[in-house]
């Protein structure tokens, strides 16, 4: 007799997993903008603001064509956890000028966390490596005002924007060679 | 639908070689990171080495490392798993698995005795 | 031994709730790393039952969930059925070793 039938397809084939994550990348993206938006409808930004612990942005788009999928996807992840823990931050720490962005900031954290997921997800069933993230930095101290916590705001939905747009295109890069 | 199946398990003296092999079908193979995981009897499930979807990573468990070779043939979709030095403990069902591992193939028995 | 652990035996009644539980450390499911739990039926392969913590492949009843909390994850069974009698395993990437790793498994039994 021959080999007992294989099972059923249960899952995405990663060509497949990496789509979707575009357009969940995508998605994430424009949540960003549109609460950056909000953000500097509600609290004018005063020229660009920075927070010394968010990543730097990960790539310039003319460097993109000598991009390998490992290590944007490594440093993606990386970037992105990071990203999650500023948000995480500033929801908690954030003080009171900011709840006016609840709920969206829940949402946008739920879907950053999905979108970790997924590129892991996507690493796995490629099977490459998932070096350790950096260690943990130490925790960050709340805002010294409420205007330092809408500073911070602005830096990190600056930041974050910044690089789901470097992820969205080195993705659909990437998509070319697998 | 999904198929993995392994071939070349069977009885080999310690010290011996084998070479297992696992045609893949029913799925994008060149797309999928492939696993050899084994399952001593009456045991549980011991992860053994995996290789990245292109080949260009590979990684092995402590207990395999220096004996065991897994590769992949892209172009024939299937994967191996040459064993050398072989030992009584590596006696066990080998899986080939795709993925995270997603799709498991039905194993082949490798008996190390003399 | 095994880097993630699991109890060995589990069982309850058919219709019960039973919980198996996976617990791991800092390099592997504390890490941001994704849990998966497989079934094997006596004499059979085993089978992807829920990946990425709690996401349930296509064709797997609902009955089935996962969940991760710190450093450990759950597998929880509702409505307890005899062909659920199995030997079931979590799984996690793991930093240090740069592969997966396996729980001992858990034997289910239906009473």
């Known amino acids: 007799p021959g080999p007992p039938p294989g099972p059923p397809r249960v899952s995405p084939d990663p060509r497949a997993e990496l789509d979707s994550t575009v357009l969940l990348t995508r998605s994430l993206l424009a949540d960003t903008r549109q609460l950056a938006a909000q953000l500097r409808d509600k609290f004018p930004a005063d020229g660009d603001h920075n927070l010394d612990s968010l990543p730097t942005l990960a790539m310039s788009a003319g460097a993109l064509g000598a991009l390998q999928l490992p290590g944007v996807l490594t440093r993606l992840r990386a970037d992105l956890l990071s990203y999650l823990r500023h948000v995480q931050w500033l929801r908690r720490a954030g003080g009171s000028s900011l709840k006016t962005l609840e709920p969206e900031l829940g949402t946008l954290q739920a879907r950053l966390d999905r979108l970790l997921r997924r590129l892991q997800l996507l690493m796995s069933r490629l099977a490459l490596p998932q070096p350790p993230p950096d260690p943990p930095a130490p925790p960050l101290a709340p805002p010294s005002s409420a205007w330092g916590g809408i500073r911070a705001a602005h830096a990190i939905l600056g930041g974050l924007h910044l690089t789901l747009d470097w992820a969205v295109r080195g993705l659909l890069l990437l998509k070319t060679r697998l | 639908e999904v198929q993995l199946l392994e071939s070349g398990g069977g009885l080999v003296q310690p010290g011996g070689s084998l070479r297992l092999s696992c045609a893949a079908s029913?799925?994008?193979?060149?797309?999928?990171?492939m696993h050899w995981v084994r399952q001593a009897p009456g045991k549980g499930l011991e992860w053994v080495a995996v290789i990245s979807y292109d080949g260009s990573y590979k990684y092995y468990a402590d207990s395999v490392k220096g004996r065991f070779t897994i590769s992949r043939d892209n172009s024939k979709n299937t994967l191996y798993l040459q064993m050398n030095s072989l030992r009584a403990e590596d006696t066990a069902v080998y899986y080939c698995?795709?993925?995270?591992?997603?799709?498991w193939g039905q194993g082949t028995l490798v008996t190390v005795s003399s | 031994q095994s880097v993630l652990t699991q109890p060995p035996s589990a069982s309850g009644t058919p219709g019960q709730r039973v919980t198996i539980s996976c617990s791991g450390s800092?390099?592997?499911?504390?890490?941001?790393?994704?849990v998966h739990w497989y079934q094997q039926l006596p004499g059979t392969a085993p089978k992807l039952l829920i990946y990425?913590?709690?996401e349930r492949p296509s064709g797997v009843p609902d009955r089935f969930s996962g969940s991760k909390s710190g450093t450990s994850a759950s597998l929880a069974i509702s409505g307890l059925r005899s062909e659920d009698e199995a030997d079931y395993y979590c799984?996690?990437?793991?930093?240090?070793?740069?592969?997966?790793?396996f729980g001992g498994g858990t034997k289910l039994t239906v009473l």
């Open positions: 799984a996690a990437w793991d930093d240090s070793l740069y592969g997966p790793v």
């Open positions: 800092s390099s592997n499911i504390g890490s941001d790393l994704d």
């Open positions: 990425s913590n709690e």
């Open positions: 698995a795709a993925g995270v591992p997603d799709y």
């Open positions: 029913g799925f994008t193979f060149s797309s999928y990171g």
